[in-house]
């Protein structure tokens, strides 16, 4: 996260890390106690998810292997649309006042609105400073039609853009897969920008989770 | 400003390991987001990439050359190396390394461009 | 593998022409296309990014375009410093990262 700060204290009791072994590889959430949302291009053959501290490495932190990992059957490796991913863990998670379901959205929100996105990613670029904290920061959601003004033909209309003008508030590798949350529902997750992260009117781009949930509930019921 | 210059023997004898070392001068190799990159050129002919190596030491090889090559990085030396074994006279040629700046964060940070290079070594592969 | 094609493998211009040099590649690879300059002797040197984006120090005489399978590199008006062999270059999601086989720019 760029230009942000340490996130409240169990401000985001929904968000987990996907480490590699013990490397932080992406972010993600919890939508029950079987089920992380992430990106797409997050995936991997094994994961370790990290729950319930906002502490990487917190030994009082909950830490769940996860072997099945469902990718969006449209997701484009070119294109990258599409880009979010189930992934059901081997054991259930223990719910608590530090590990709680996200809220699906049952809108889309609209252009202009406040959202804070998450995450335990670099918070510097390119040089990498990755913090042990997680770290948040305020954004605002960008019309499609500002947004195509930047990035022109890659931008899909599943995709969501949210930044400051003329900030540098965004988010970075390690981020990627973790949640765009407006108005206390899951909006958006991390998915790609530009590079240099933190670039001043280069919005982060996000996989709009408003236009997926029936595919999130069908992946789940399909795979219990 | 980022520098990048490659070292290694000039000549090397047919089926023995080929080693090349680059060292970055004005960055450092442990704490900047890039790919770290060898490509190759024989005489008269284009651009081979060998492969790269990124921030978190994974590894990643041309198939044609991947059960010959090794890169690995010295972060204590701020260097990374090319070994390539088995060599043979078609291995001759200038060899590069290069820095790979990534095209943007995230999904798109697998992807990248070479935006500073060495000057290139040569090596001959002869007995 | 995704294979890249460039054409003319050379061509002959005179100083001040518009010259245009096309890459295409054997399936889609989106905007991940890069473009260099490489002079006899010399490293190569990158020009164009993502297609289109011009790399910082590089005369505004040099633009790329395109998406998907087919890219062009123009120099709008050729300078005596143009005169170089032009490589593209595609970056992929999985390797390998490949080159075009080169376009020589001479003097005519």
């Known amino acids: 996260i760029i230009d942000g700060a340490p996130c409240a204290r169990g401000s985001h009791p929904w968000q987990v890390a996907l480490l590699s072994g013990n490397q932080l590889h992406c972010g993600g959430v919890l939508v029950n106690e079987r089920w992380v949302l992430t990106a797409a291009h997050c995936k991997m053959n094994e994961y370790t998810v990290h729950l319930g501290s906002d502490t990487l490495g917190d030994r009082r932190a909950q830490r769940i292997k996860a072997s099945k990992s469902f990718r969006h059957p449209g997701y484009s490796t070119q294109t990258h649309v599409n880009d979010l991913m189930l992934v059901k863990l081997n054991s259930q998670a223990r719910l608590s006042s530090m590990v709680k379901k996200v809220r699906l959205p049952s809108r889309c929100e609209p252009p202009g609105t406040t959202c804070t996105v998450s995450g335990w990613g670099t918070t510097t670029s390119p040089d990498v400073t990755f913090p042990s904290d997680l770290m948040c920061v305020d954004v605002k959601l960008i019309s499609p039609q500002d947004c195509t003004k930047v990035y022109k033909d890659l931008l899909e209309n599943s995709m969501l853009c949210a930044g400051i003008p003329d900030s540098k508030k965004n988010a970075c590798n390690g981020d990627s897969g973790g949640p765009l949350v407006c108005r206390g529902t899951l909006q958006g997750l991390v998915s790609w920008g530009t590079f240099p992260c933190g670039q001043p009117n280069d919005p982060g781009v996000y996989t709009q989770v408003c236009k997926f949930t029936k595919w999130i509930n069908d992946t789940m019921k399909k795979h219990r | 400003q980022l520098q990048l210059q490659e070292s290694g023997p000039g000549l090397v004898k047919p089926s023995e390991t080929l080693s090349l070392t680059c060292t970055v001068s004005g960055g450092s190799i442990s704490s900047d987001d890039y790919y770290w990159v060898w490509i190759r050129q024989p005489p008269g002919k284009g651009l081979e990439w060998i492969g790269s190596i990124d921030y978190y030491a994974s590894t990643y090889y041309s198939p044609s050359l991947k059960s010959r090559v090794t890169i690995s990085v010295d972060t204590s030396k701020n260097q990374f190396s090319l070994k390539l074994s088995s060599v043979t006279a078609a291995d001759t040629a200038v060899y590069y390394c290069?820095?790979?700046?990534?095209?943007?964060?995230?999904?798109?940070?697998?992807?990248?461009?070479?935006?500073?290079w060495g000057q290139g070594t040569t090596v001959t592969v002869s007995s | 593998d995704i294979q890249m094609t460039q054409s003319p493998s050379s061509l002959s211009a005179s100083v001040g022409d518009r010259v245009t040099i096309t890459c295409r590649a054997s399936q889609s690879i989106s905007s991940y296309l890069n473009w260099y300059q490489q002079k006899p002797g010399k490293a190569p040197k990158l020009l164009i990014y993502s297609a289109s984006s011009l790399q910082s120090g590089v005369p505004s005489r040099f633009s790329g375009s395109g998406s998907g399978t087919d890219f062009t590199l123009t120099i709008s008006s050729l300078q005596p410093e143009d005169f170089a062999t032009y490589y593209c270059q595609q970056s992929p999601y999985f390797p390998p990262l490949t080159f075009g086989g080169g376009t020589k720019v001479e003097i005519k």
């Open positions: 290069a820095r790979g700046r990534p095209l943007g964060y995230g999904a798109k940070h697998y992807y990248y461009g070479m935006d500073v």
